[in-house]
């Protein structure tokens, strides 16, 4: 049993838990940046709150062959409840309104470090 | 890159009304406490007031309250603050900014012109 515990699948991860790591990952994202992140590609900005992770997927997903933002892409969409795939546009998004992927992330990140200390893991 | 660009300064009579707008661009608006801070002539920088991100609180300095009432528009990525019952100590350029205690999150205006005076 001691054996075949380590093929057992691991229970789902807790909301806060999803939560505090994809923050993590958007730390190492800003931290790390050096030269412009996905070489200074434009995303649709967003304007409201409620379905936030679906429509910052729906922006990030439109950018290709960026490593960078890859496990980002990964993390959110585990918190968004539909598939997302490049070209969706969300009733979210500020139409004609872009801004820059690294200026993008920073301010997931900031609105992500709101809602964990807010207590909103969802 | 960002930008937060003021209007609707001028000169306004003693008890008039005067409403400023900030438009802002390059980053996400709606995310943001953004704010509304002031420096008269020979002064230091003021808070006036904050409103946080979605409009769920808002902050007056107590020279203010009762007169001025800030706003914000997400959809438009638009700042407002409307000023009602202006006196002559009012007088000062009027900067929007982003107001989230960060330097790492910090973005100012350049500012605009009111002057209350007869």
């Known amino acids: 049993l001691t054996c075949l515990g380590g093929f057992a699948s691991p229970g789902p991860v807790p909301p806060s838990t999803a939560l505090r790591e994809l923050i993590e990952e958007l730390v190492n994202i800003t931290q790390n940046q050096k030269a412009p992140l996905c070489n200074g590609s434009m995303v649709w900005s967003i304007n409201l709150t409620a379905g936030m992770y679906c429509a910052a997927l729906e922006s990030l997903i439109n950018v290709s062959g960026c490593s960078a933002i890859e496990k980002t892409q990964r993390m959110l969409s585990g918190f968004c409840p539909h598939k997302v795939s490049a070209g969706q546009f969300s009733s979210l998004h500020v139409r004609d309104t872009k801004i820059e992927v690294a200026q993008f992330v920073k301010d997931l990140l900031l609105h992500l470090k709101k809602l964990f200390r807010e207590g909103q893991f969802n | 890159g960002v930008q937060l660009l003021e209007s609707g300064g001028g000169l306004v009579q003693p008890g008039g009304s005067l409403r400023l707008s900030c438009a802002a661009s390059?980053?996400?608006?709606?995310?943001?406490?953004m704010g509304w801070a002031r420096q008269a002539p020979g002064k230091g920088l003021e808070w006036v007031s904050v409103i946080s991100d979605y409009g769920r609180g808002t902050y007056y300095a107590d020279s203010v309250k009762g007169r001025f009432t800030i706003s914000r528009d997400n959809s438009k990525n638009t700042l407002y603050l409307q000023m009602n019952s202006l006196r002559a100590e009012d007088t000062a350029v009027y900067y929007c900014?982003?107001?989230?205690?960060?330097?790492?999150?910090?973005?100012w205006g350049q500012g605009t012109l009111v002057t209350v005076s007869s």
């Open positions: 900014a982003t107001a989230e205690g960060d330097d790492t999150f910090d973005y």
């Open positions: 390059g980053f996400t608006f709606a995310w943001y406490d």
